[in-house]
């Protein structure tokens, strides 16, 4: 069977006026996953995003991440889009320096 990912979105200061938003997916199986940032509902181009490898996390499941740099104050226009085993979920950017975990249920 499949194990849905835990998705976690965080933000960190980049340069002045910019922040880096990172979306991490962990504890999922099988390893095939789509993880991408969307702006105003549409996927960003590949050259504006950085991806981590899909790696084993030691429990028979996998983890990966995607990040992009955006203008501070525009965070609400962005969502992390996750697709795994025919299911999808969207994960907004939290305000301030907080972070939030979403568990995606199949």
């Amino acid at each position: 069977g499949s194990v849905p990912p835990m998705v976690n979105v965080t933000r960190s200061e980049a340069s002045e006026g910019n922040i880096t938003v990172t979306c991490r997916a962990s504890s999922f199986y099988p390893r095939n996953i789509t993880l991408t940032w969307r702006q105003d509902g549409v996927s960003l181009s590949h050259d504006t995003q950085q991806w981590g490898d899909v790696l084993p996390d030691g429990n028979g499941t996998y983890q990966t991440w995607v990040a992009t740099r955006i203008c501070q104050g525009e965070e609400q226009r962005f969502t992390c889009y996750m697709e795994h085993s025919g299911n999808h979920s969207t994960h907004p950017v939290p305000s301030g320096n907080s972070h939030h975990h979403h568990h995606h249920h199949h």
């Epitope: 789509t34 509902g41 549409v42 609400q76 226009r77 299911n87 969207t90 305000s95």
Partner: antibody
Framework: EVQLVQSGAEVKKPGSSVKVSCKAS????????IEWVRQAPGQGLEWIGA????????NYNEKFKDRATLTADKSTNTAYMELSSLRSEDTAVYFC??????????WGQGTLVTVSS | DIQMTQSPSSLSASVGDRVTITCRAS??????LAWYQQKPGKAPKLLIY???TLADGVPSRFSGSGSGTDFTLTISSLQPEDFATYYC?????????FGQGTKVEIK
Amino acid sequence: EVQLVQSGAEVKKPGSSVKVSCKASGYAFTNYLIEWVRQAPGQGLEWIGAINPGSGATNYNEKFKDRATLTADKSTNTAYMELSSLRSEDTAVYFCARFLGNYFDNWGQGTLVTVSS
Amino acid sequence: DIQMTQSPSSLSASVGDRVTITCRASGNIHSYLAWYQQKPGKAPKLLIYYAETLADGVPSRFSGSGSGTDFTLTISSLQPEDFATYYCQQFWTTPYTFGQGTKVEIK
């Protein structure tokens, strides 16, 4: 102009199924998620689920997971919502809407589904 | 699931009145809140998104505020076409949930 045009009203028997269509125009259909919401007579709004028309991947409200099936046909720019094992409580207006980032910006006109024996 | 509670459930007001509707979330939804207006037999119409951003074509008498768990929709000077039902909706996490609605009626 973005438009979502839904199929016409339906009258169904308890235990049967209904399939509502939502034809999109005026934008790139596969770029945006399509959401489904229902509203029982005189009641509030309830989210059913969403589909990515590009990939077919879905996200369901747990309440509807066992009875709702969302699909999309890229060749006709049409999304579908099928609800099975209908009961009287499913009598409602069913809406499709486009997900623009983090809100629904355009809605279909609604489809009334009446479940009656 | 995040519960959205709107108040009041209905109100009576006159043209020109200032009207305020509140929406409270059962958890932190940051600023991921939208307000819709719905008239009988019609689909909801987007008024405000991200808690305070006015949607295209919406008159400036409508405004939204709040973040976290408490939000407000204000109509600064009620017009005849504003008599309708208003809903809030959270977009922080699925299932996306709506408030139960506030019906604005003519006094």
